[in-house]
């Protein structure tokens, strides 16, 4: 019988026995950064090499007895959840090992500094095909563990980490909380989070999705034949580096941008019960679990989007987020969100040659959120329209006037403390796609994009009386880039994209005495390119 | 050489006050910064450090991802430290696990 | 290049101790243990079990339980096979391998059991 | 422990000829079937690993299919060095259990 876990991460319609070849992931080298090893287990044998580099700190404790199942315990059942034989995601991938972790499964960051620094060496002396590195271990907010990790994703070699086991926010972790790293919580068989003790996985937008991580099958040390269970964010970033390792033997040529969305967009969605999470990060957590894609060939054909939350901005008066995307993504829409619902909305503005998301508070704000729409669109030449506050009774709003530009999202930006509620709502004159509508008070803002093939339209849902949530989503084949409220009045908490849907989200009715001409409506951008389809359809 | 004028090179250790390991330091050095200046960085540390009648010892030189060195030193040294020329911030090193 | 090499053949009575090596080369060490194989004259192969050069852990085959020990010497990078109170149907040719995969034999040492 | 049945167990044939041989498991082994050639006085060779790939150096006239219980070993066009006893093993389970043996002959 085949383990849950690898089931889970099998697509609908596959069997995972049939699905997951001997030779799955054999053009990758995955790299692991953990405790010494068992290389002659049976799952293992001959897919693991491990190498000389070794860098640990003594173990704790005067009576510590070394015993060497105890020693390769962690090490040695991650290596089988990557490649092993058996039980193992990416059956065909080779590894290789460097001990940094002692007998306790405690290192120290310069010890796995050295340890990425002997990576990039290697890479250099002998550059072979994609490489993965996994680090199934997690210490406490490290600037420069961080910046290595970033230094080494900038080389071109993707790394996967655990999101770590303290039932807190992974951005107070390294290298979780790295952007460039891959970071992987834990789920069960249920699709619940893990628990583990009084603790369990980590959670937030320091994660990227979430993986098999709760009653493990793989390799045991104990001995070459023996097979333990285990559980842990360390065996669901294993198993997001063993499918990196599948979609990479298959295409070599992804980049880490790449990589990270076509991760993100073959997951099973909303399949996680968000009431295990605090309930200030639930909307910060991506409900993902890592799966394999259906087919071993491309999806270039996609245009990819992957939502990036912004680190809390504060409640100062001032106070800004700033939400980026990767260096290969643009950023195509950008919004704000407040729980209070005191904010002076979003703009997008260049910051070191590249468009960024900035969110603003508001006084007496507790803070804001800045969301950006990052996404996967070659040869694109972005750039942001604005026009200021109209003061006119119609509202402001912009354009995107060059040729061959389409609409790819809206922000508003306000000044003043509150827009004003009283105001009818501004409705879309109808047969106008190209353009944003705000409030007259506000600054509005359209990121406009040219793009081989790139086609957009706008979607929208309005609901009279005012409601907690408003949702509009885009339609198979394409894809969401912008999501915005009209108007950006002050019970509107924000907007933000979920996968393909627009979420708006107000203030709870009840509390702000809402009259129903503060009628809510989701506007969302979809957009999808030809010019990537058709690439697609010639390659096959 | 002094630090650039108005960079002011900045201190970083754990907030997990049990996973601190104070005593070793990871110097990184400014994004530019070649081999032969991160040694010439450590052994004027070294110098300077022995001079105020305090041992350190270089525990190693990185460069090919970050350039910096990982030292071990009394923290009374930190201040010196953070003033040598390249030096971009300092961290206290820390302990990771397994998870 | 990767080889096994095996220690020449021998000749023992009934009830008496044999013990083979196999010196392994060309590859690390450590990614692998050694399986022993054996084959009567006209016969079909048998795995006997394997044993690690990284911790000298040991899985016998049942039929062998007692009367064999498997050992390595990492210094040497050298496996060895003792069989012990020998019969004569213990006549063979005894093989080393490459791990579980059994990708690399050695050449063979022929063992023979007679009065 | 898993009993492993070749068929035939010998066979005559020519050079050029495509021989086929066929091997059977007691119980279901998934794709962990390999396949050895052995010639006289010599240590077996592997040929075939997880039932159809090829180790490097091996030649391209020589593979394997089937999964579950069923495998065959394909030889495309018999070469004169070809001519050896050929094995089946299970690496399924522990132990290893390998097939009688078939005996390709000249005919």
């Known amino acids: 019988s085949i383990p849950w876990n690898l089931e889970r991460i099998t697509p609908p319609r596959y069997r995972a026995d049939e699905y997951q070849p001997p030779d799955g992931g054999s053009l990758v080298e995955v790299y692991l950064l953990d405790t010494s090893i068992q290389s002659d287990h049976r799952e293992i044998e001959g897919r693991v090499m491990v190498t000389d580099f070794e860098n640990v700190p003594e173990e704790d404790g005067t009576r510590f007895h070394r015993q060497a199942s105890k020693c390769d315990s962690h090490g040695t059942h991650l290596a089988g959840v990557v490649s092993g034989r058996d039980a193992g995601v990416a059956k065909g991938a080779s590894m290789r090992s460097l001990r940094v972790l002692n007998c306790q499964g405690k290192g120290t960051v310069s010890g796995t500094l050295i340890g990425l620094e002997f990576i990039r060496k290697s890479q250099l002396v002998q550059p072979v095909g994609p490489l993965v590195v996994l680090l199934p271990l997690a210490g406490g907010y490290s600037r420069v563990l961080n910046a290595a990790c970033q230094r080494l994703a900038r080389a071109g070699v993707v790394l996967v980490t655990a999101a770590g086991n303290f039932r807190d926010d992974a951005c107070l972790y390294s290298p979780a909380s790295a952007p460039e790293v891959i970071t992987v919580g834990a789920t069960n068989a249920q699709d619940q989070p893990v628990t583990l003790g009084t603790l369990g996985t980590n959670f937030g937008r320091c994660v990227d999705l979430f993986a098999p991580g709760e009653d493990i099958i793989g390799a045991s040390s104990d001995c070459s034949t023996c097979f333990v269970s285990q559980s842990g964010t360390s065996q669901a970033a294993a198993h997001v580096a063993g499918i990196a390792a599948m979609m990479l033997s298959a295409e070599p040529e992804l980049t880490l941008a790449e990589l990270r969305q076509r991760l993100i967009h073959f997951s099973a969605k909303d399949v996680i019960n968000e009431a295990w999470f605090p309930e200030d990060q639930r909307v910060l957590t991506p409900n993902l679990v890592a799966a394999l894609p259906p087919s071993t060939h491309g999806a270039g054909w996609q245009l990819f989007c992957r939502t990036v939350w912004s680190a809390h901005s504060g409640p100062t008066r001032m106070a800004t987020a700033i939400a980026r995307c990767a260096p290969d993504e643009e950023l195509l829409s950008c919004s704000s969100f407040s729980r209070s619902g005191k904010r002076r909305g979003e703009r997008m503005e260049a910051q070191g040659g590249k468009l960024v998301c900035r969110a603003h508070n508001a006084f007496g704000g507790e803070g804001v959120y800045a969301i950006a729409r990052c996404c996967l669109l070659p040869q694109a030449n972005c750039s942001v329209h604005t026009a200021p506050p109209a003061e006119a009774s119609m509202g402001t709003r912009v354009h995107c006037h060059q040729q061959g530009h389409v609409l790819t999202g809206c922000s508003s930006h306000w000044e003043v403390e509150d827009l004003g509620t009283h105001k009818p709502p501004v409705l879309r004159p109808r047969g106008q796609p190209n353009q944003c509508v705000g409030h007259r008070e506000a600054s509005i803002h359209a990121s406009c994009c040219h793009a081989p093939g790139l086609e957009c339209k706008v979607k929208e849902h309005g609901i009279p009386a005012p409601q907690e949530q408003v949702t509009v989503a885009c339609e198979e084949g394409w894809t969401l880039t912008g999501c915005s409220a009209l108007p950006g009045t002050s019970h509107v908490l924000g907007a933000y994209a979920v996968d393909n849907t627009c979420v708006v989200r107000s203030r709870d009715v009840s509390t702000t005495g809402s009259t129903s001409e503060e009628a809510v409506t989701a506007v969302a951008i979809c957009c999808r390119s030809r010019h990537l389809a058709q690439a697609s359809q010639e390659l096959q | 050489e002094a630090p650039e004028h108005g960079t002011t090179a900045t201190f970083h250790r754990c907030a997990k006050d049990p996973w601190r390991l104070p005593g070793t330091y990871v110097v990184v050095l400014k994004e530019e910064t070649h081999l032969s200046q991160s040694e010439r960085t450590a052994r004027r540390l070294q110098a300077q450090a022995a001079r105020r009648g305090y041992l350190t010892k270089i525990l190693h030189v990185f460069h090919g991802l970050l350039p910096g060195f990982l030292v071990k030193m009394s923290g009374d040294l930190l201040e010196l430290a953070l003033k040598l020329p390249h030096v971009d911030y300092i961290e206290e090193d820390s302990s990771v696990f397994a998870q | 290049q990767v080889q096994l090499v095996q220690s020449g053949a021998e000749v023992k009575k009934p009830g008496a101790s044999v013990k083979v090596s196999c010196k392994a080369s060309g590859y690390a060490l450590y990614n692998y243990g050694i399986s022993w194989v054996r084959q009567a004259p006209g016969q079909g192969l048998e795995w006997m079990g394997w044993?690690?050069?990284?911790?000298?852990?040991?899985n016998y085959a049942q039929k062998l339980q007692g009367r064999g020990t498997m050992t390595t010497d990492p210094s040497t990078s050298t496996a060895y096979m003792e069989l012990r109170s020998l019969r004569s149907d213990d006549t063979a040719v005894y093989y080393c391998?490459?791990?579980?995969?059994?990708?690399?034999w050695g050449q063979g040492t022929t063992v023979t059991v007679s009065s | 422990d898993i009993q492993m049945t070749q068929s035939p167990s010998s066979l005559s044939a020519s050079v050029g000829d495509r021989v086929t041989i066929t091997c059977r498991a007691s119980q279901s082994i998934n794709n962990w079937l390999d396949w050895y050639q052995q010639k006289p006085g010599k240590a077996p060779k592997l040929l075939i690993y997880a039932a159809s790939t090829r180790p490097s150096g091996v030649p391209s006239r020589f593979s394997g299919s089937g999964s579950g219980t069923d495998f065959t070993l394909t030889i495309s066009s018999l070469q004169p060095e070809d001519f050896a006893t050929y094995y089946c093993q299970q690496d399924q389970d522990i132990p290893p259990t390998f097939g009688q043996g078939t005996k390709v002959e000249i005919k």
């Open positions: 044993v690690s050069f990284y911790n000298g852990n040991t």
């Open positions: 391998a490459r791990g579980y995969v059994m990708d690399i």
